[in-house]
Amino acid sequence: EICGPGIDIRNDYQQLKRLENCTVIEGYLHILLISKAEDYRSYRFPKLTVITEYLLLFRVAGLESLGDLFPNLTVIRGWKLFYNYALVIFEMTNLKDIGLYNLRNITRGAIRIEKNADLCYLSTVDWSLILDAVSNNYIVGNKPPKECGDLCPGTMEEKPMCEKTTINNEYNYRCWTTNRCQKMCPSTCGKRACTENNECCHPECLGSCSAPDNDTACVACRHYYYAGVCVPACPPNTYRFEGWRCVDRDFCANILSAESSDSEGFVIHDGECMQECPSGFIRNGSQSMYCIPCEGPCPKVCEEEKKTKTIDSVTSAQMLQGCTIFKGNLLINIRRGNNIASELENFMGLIEVVTGYVKIRHSHALVSLSFLKNLRLILGEEQLEGNYSFYVLDNQNLQQLWDWDHRNLTIKAGKMYFAFNPKLCVSEIYRMEEVTGTKGRQSKGDINTRNNGERASCESDVLHFTSTTTSKNRIIITWHRYRPPDYRDLISFTVYYKEAPFKNVTEYDGQDACGSNSWNMVDVDLPPNKDVEPGILLHGLKPWTQYAVYVKAVTLTMVENDHIRGAKSEILYIRTNASVPSIPLDVLSASNSSSQLIVKWNPPSLPNGNLSYYIVRWQRQPQDGYLYRHNYCSKDKIPIRKYADGTIDIEEVTENPKTEVCGGEKGPCCACPKTEAEKQAEKEEAEYRKVFENFLHNSIFVPRPE
């Protein structure tokens, strides 16, 4: 039987009974938060062979092995993952071994086995036989291997039963527990699975099979399951479902959901039966089961019961996330906030149409309205008293409405009103009149020329750059010396710069009046010599990175015909030079024959340019004679090798430590102090652990019902 869509067993171990008849869990399996130690020996689920998503175990007291619970679990597909992992075993206080001796394949995702104080038999499992890539596995904070003394079946009797493989240059027996070997298929099967008797399964089988070369005898399917057969693709008139089986249209139409969006049911798209159309697509009609591409962002209509939605905080803006059409009026009143511009853009940036009016008042935190970056139509179906559909009053720091060179905004009905916006130049308002088609609608008092822009440099001259020079982490720029009518009015220059992967930034991006600014700022004093052009060296930059730079003249508020003159440059885009890439990551090597090594690695985290090739160097190393001095099959004879960790425990040293000259003296070497890079790596590691733990807690802890 198929169970699902995900099973969450918590608090009471007797809930495990829910797994009784399951052969496939279509979804995830959580077993967690069982704080009372129980005897699990009476619980056994031999029917369960496949979990299509992931398996998560967390704080289950008294559970010592998973092998008795799930003796036949063969495949975890990882169709959906838990924070990139298909198998998570976290803080299992009593778990002594994993013991999933029939687990043969984790199709997607990595494993995370962390903080299990009693857990052994981790180094005896060759995960590369189960997963495609082991480099993302995270196995940390479990019982130290030297305290485990893991022995595979038959090793003590000197009749080893398990097969050997090489992990990290260690050729060793592979097993799950003291009496269960890790199953390996004959090399003749290649990537295929095999039966218990080592006969190769059909290529469409995954994990194992009950008969050789038979696509109806698979324990699990490599691709898809349909009508008892494993198939490479779903047959005509059937559709992929949950990444593992084929279903017909009728089945898809009859799936019921508890999601609030279920009023229209599942859809069929691109050969798959899914809950809703994927990003960029929309249903072809309200009761349709099929999707068509959206023109631009997919429409999402949001409506405010009270007709007017007040945006006075990030929280209130959050309610509009994803909305493209807002039915009602927007009242924006943002007096303060942290990182407000980018937060508002995140939540309101998709709004294209407002059916009523837009009113912006007392929003002292706003420098620009560019957070409404897709607004293209204000219908003005409802208007403020005086027939206003765009109303801007008393915004002390508002300097820009939108970047009119890249913006089309239409106000279909109603007038505009602007008053008491001291930093908003009237020219900006006049430009909006032209773009929005409202020119001629406003009466004289609707745009106040005295109290809009009275504290801004509204007549701007253009500063021109004269030279630019780049290196891998520096940019040198110079510009024409600005000469206002009275040279004493020029105080200094401010250079603004930031990383800009694309040439689409504006001066007001990410900027608000509360200190948040995505631009870095540097003040540049005037050169004492009047003939020297001002310039700056920007350093500490990243190699092979495009930066946006512009310069502003800082002038006295010199009034000329009621206007303040200022000067600024256009935005200049400039790329730093390439540099040496950082080291390739996760280098792994393994031998697959007596004359070959396979070396794998991931690209460097900082390519610092376009990577064109890698250089691989190798050299032969002398064999370590130490390996031949002991009988490793006898447990009590295994010497414990302790590597330098800054201390030496005399009892554990089985032979005289090598002495080398260290710091000018003979004697055992101390561990070198950690380099900055190592300290940074440790810090990042700790941070990563915290992020995962937070994710885990946030995902699984739910408030008790009222």
Epitope: E1, I2, C3, G4, P5, G6, I7, D8, R18, N21, C22, E26, G27, D250, F251, N254, I255, L256, S257, A258, E259, S260, D262, S263, G265, Q275, P705
Partner: nanobody, 123 residues
């Protein structure tokens, strides 16, 4: 977790009507797909009807289509089954079941079950 209690069963004549109720407690009711199953004496449990979390969509077994109507009231945490034109073969213990997130047409292993209420159709 979720507790389900059925009521409304009883003895009814062929052609008659009956309304079953299922009261739920313990978790947000609307986050579950709700179903009715039935088990006649000596037979396997069979699916009768199911309804989505919002109540906007439902499905029925062929044997009850047109005669039975499933509904839910999320404000009262209650599931209903209105049974009309009852037949002798409708005699069974009727179970209410809940499953989180969703339910596929072939799903039998629901997460939570009630104890059942007996419906007897006889003259």
């Amino acid at each position: 977790e979720v507790q389900l209690v059925e009521s409304g069963g009883g003895l009814v004549q062929p052609g008659g009507s009956l309304r079953l109720s299922c009261a739920a407690s313990g978790r947000t009711f609307s986050s579950f797909v709700m179903s009715w199953f039935r088990q006649a004496p000596g037979k396997e449990r069979e699916f009768v009807s199911a309804i989505s979390g919002s109540g906007s969509r439902s499905r029925y077994a062929d044997s009850v289509k047109g005669r039975f109507t499933i509904s839910r009231d999320n404000s009262k945490n209650t599931l209903y089954l209105q049974m009309n034109s009852l037949r002798a073969e409708d005699t069974a213990v009727y179970y209410c079941a809940a499953n989180p997130r969703r339910a596929t047409p072939d799903l039998i292993q629901y997460a939570y079950w009630g104890q059942g209420t007996l419906v007897t159709v006889s003259s």
